[in-house]
Amino acid sequence: MMTGTIETTGNISAEKGGSIILQCHLSSTTAQVTQVNWEQQDQLLAICNADLGWHISPSFKDRVAPGPGLGLTLQSLTVNDTGEYFCIYHTYPDGTYTGRIFLEVLESSVAEHGARFQIP
């Protein structure tokens, strides 16, 4: 029986060019965490395996840093990073727990200001 719950940072926003921490926390279970996956759409961004540690997708290694803890830090954000992110906890004996975070990457206020007052 799965008794655990996942708490996440929920819906978050950040400025283009900045960084953000995606954080999930599994509580209310004594199950052993064997691996945590961080996913965007249906692709793996990173994994943290209990035995093997962190692995980051080569496509994201320049912009993704492991941690803090089992979280994930996204750097040099672009508007294309906007979307759903999932933390997936593989546990024994409970099974799989999934948390969802929606990230919105906003144009920086400086960029918005500049675009609004462009000189023809």
Epitope: N37, Q43, L44, I47
Partner: nanobody, 125 residues
């Protein structure tokens, strides 16, 4: 959404052969890791064989090397597992699995997000 449907399981004597098939729908032209996993009663699901569709790289667990062969038919979007010299310890439910893009440890069940319903393979001595 990717959907996977296995077939070809059955009962066979030790030393015999079976060919499993996995029909995949919803698979795009992107690179995928597609593989076969198995789970015997009371045991954890384990990776058997995986193929990367982009470059046809293959990965096998040690216990099946030289006996099992994974292959794909891109035109039919079908994955195969040819199993020869079967042993009683190969008895298990066999599952087809897939993941688009990067997979750090191809034979780890934790790295796949699309799964079929499974097909039973029973090898008697």
């Amino acid at each position: 959404q990717v959907q996977l449907a296995e077939s070809g399981g059955g009962s066979v004597q030790a030393g015999g052969s079976l060919r499993l098939s996995c029909a995949a729908s919803g698979v795009t032209s992107d690179s995928y890791h597609m593989g076969w996993f198995r789970q015997a009663p009371g045991k954890e699901r384990e990776g058997v064989a995986v193929i990367k569709t982009g470059d046809a790289s293959t990965y096998y667990t040690d216990s099946v090397k030289g006996r099992f062969t994974i292959s794909q038919d891109n035109a039919k979007n079908t994955l195969y597992l040819q199993m020869n010299s079967l042993k009683p310890e190969d008895t298990a439910m066999y599952y087809c699995a897939a993941r688009r893009g990067w997979v750090p440890a191809p034979l780890s069940q934790y790295n796949y997000n699309y799964w079929g319903q499974g097909t039973q393979v029973t090898v008697s001595s």
